[in-house]
Amino acid sequence: AWELTILHTNDVHSRLEQTSEDSSKCVNASRCMGGVARLFTKVQQIRRAEPNVLLLDAGDQYQGTIWFTVYKGAEVAHFMNALRYDAMALGNHEFDNGVEGLIEPLLKEAKFPILSANIKAKGPLASQISGLYLPYKVLPVGDEVVGIVGYTSKETPFLSNPGTNLVFEDEITALQPEVDKLKTLNVNKIIALGHSGFEMDKLIAQKVRGVDVVVGGHSNTFLYTGNPPSKEVPAGKYPFIVTSDDGRKVPVVQAYAFGKYLGYLKIEFDERGNVISSHGNPILLNSSIPEDPSIKADINKWRIKLDNYSTQELGKTIVYLDGSSQSCRFRECNMGNLICDAMINNNLRHTDEMFWNHVSMCILNGGGIRSPIDERNNGTITWENLAAVLPFGGTFDLVQLKGSTLKKAFEHSVHRYGQSTGEFLQVGGIHVVYDLSRKPGDRVVKLDVLCTKCRVPSYDPLKMDEVYKVILPNFLANGGDGFQMIKDELLRHDSGDQDINVVSTYISKMKVIYPAVEGRIKFSTGSH
């Protein structure tokens, strides 16, 4: 028998520095978690203690904090190289800055293989990107070899900016021939490493012949055997065992997100490469694990540029950006309109000739807007200004909801109107009319939404049974501000980009902004 230790991370999302328990900015260092310096300490400890160790990442290192905004992926390559990762799979967010934003900072700089078997380059890109990412890689581990085959969510063209010269194939269809190839190369221990979410991970384990272990990402799934060490609630045991169609027991793992845990899986193989046993658990990277001093010093060196960036001008406003609670929690406010417009703009993806865009709607809880921006300061808008508007470090996510769920959400928006509560919705691509003289739960008298399957966008009445795509804060997707119906009824949820980054990118792109209050939210006569 031969034992392999798989250490794995996924969905780190730019958390290079330690964070608070909820993965936001670290406030009280004695209670902070994660970060690459602490991760390195634990990885080195395990490498010293155990003979056959692989350190793998299942994608979405990109996007999530100012680190990515400023360094654009160079920080990922640098610190992953420093930690001596053995392989990484491409996630959807690796394409957020286009293919160039993946090739230059990461693919060309990484000293470890970056993998995806279901992404195929075509046209002029094919030769440019050739060899920079691979479908699979055979890694020597001790006296043995292990094959790692990569995969990426086929939804990436809807979630990021991979351009038109990359084709995202079905994961299972693309993986099988690559696994077969590895088998012909006499590689009998094969790990599928990828970024398509837990449901697809389980399907791969079930359907792809020859895959021994699946290490996944994208769905931020927390698995744990026994008593969990922090506030994450396990979606199942670690490892999650799937019985494959050919009768094998295939362990599937994921390690939540944000570098809070290091996945730790021990696999025992027999001489024919069959999995005899698998066990382990994610390791909580809390303050009992010291931060490695040399990596920490490097982090501090790289940090300097971030502090300078915060005060640089991103663009200008020639109007007052009203982010006051008096406005945004009671009526349409132009700060809400600006943020929603930025959210839609960030999700422009022309992937189908029938659609001008795949999503046209945005909702945003007014309570999430926490500051105005005064145009009389020379009109200057900085990252620092935006951090005051959006201080909670969330993401703007893509969900799919039925029209009936959206109607419930808008009823909830005004169910206790007038108390300065945060659930009052700011919108984009939506026209809503409320009648506050009616009883709570029956106050939405008109709800029109911007069409997507059209060449000239126009507003049509919401259809209760239709499925709509909506951009919204992760806070709402998780049921925050009482929006339980969104959490309970959403049909799909893909995590998006850092909120401040979305707005800052939009302002930089527009250069000068002048959002108006333009009748997106109205109150019918006699009720307001």
Partner: antibody, heavy 116, light 105 residues
């Protein structure tokens, strides 16, 4: 995150007192702020709230018209001006951020005693 | 909106499973929080939005309910859990329950 209340003490019925709450370790101007009180040996009673930018204020019926909540975001400080004090206002007064939400932090309290 | 907690006091032993209930005088959706308070200390938030565990709070604490009836459960009492517990609604201007004193049997 730290919230430090001050300004409590002994005051006669009908008198006035101004409580302060100095905040540090977080972006004070981003948070709604509350005052909550607790009479000796009794339960918690919510007193007042002010939105992050000062544009919305709400009060418990028991203090309406007598107490005024205010804030100075440039000084990271929350205030409670208490007028026409009564014996039943005797309590430990706590300031707190966004109660009943993720960003919920409380100070250690300051004691106000209304007695002749 | 009035909040009624029961029981007002409760004796239990380390390792016990304990349940405290809270009833609102009208529907409050999931706008309910649970606090723990020890003598001479400020209250500490345990649960918000009826069932969401606050960061740093042990997983033995859990909350459930929606509308008018809510429950705080401590799955296995630890010595440090003996304290007074309050529910609080934030559907309208905040209002606390009268408290439940949990003491050692």
């Amino acid at each position: 995150v730290q919230l430090v209340e001050s300004g409590g003490g002994l005051v006669q019925p009908g008198g006035s007192l101004r409580l302060s709450c100095a905040a540090s370790g977080f972006t004070f101007s981003s948070y709604d702020m509350h005052w909550v009180r607790q009479a000796p040996g009794k339960g918690l009673e919510w007193v007042a709230v002010m939105s992050y930018d000062g544009s919305n204020k709400y009060y418990a019926d028991s203090v309406k018209g007598r107490f005024t909540i205010s804030r100075d975001n440039s000084k990271n400080t929350l205030y409670l001006q208490m007028n026409s004090l009564r014996a039943e206002d005797t309590a430990v007064y706590y300031c707190a951020t966004e109660i009943a939400a993720k960003g919920d932090y409380w100070g250690q309290g300051t004691l106000v005693t209304v007695s002749s | 909106i009035q909040m009624t907690q029961s029981p007002s006091s409760l004796s239990a032993s380390v390792g016990d499973r304990v349940t405290i209930t809270c009833r609102a005088s009208q529907g409050i959706s999931n706008y309910l929080a649970w606090y723990q308070q020890k003598p001479g200390k400020a209250p500490k938030l345990l649960i918000y939005a009826a069932s969401t565990l606050q960061s740093g709070v042990p997983s033995r604490f859990s909350g459930s309910g929606s509308g008018t009836d809510f429950t705080l459960t401590i799955s296995s009492l630890q010595p440090e859990d003996f304290a007074t517990y309050y529910c609080q609604q934030s559907y309208s201007t905040p209002h606390f329950g009268q408290g439940t004193r949990l003491e050692i049997k």
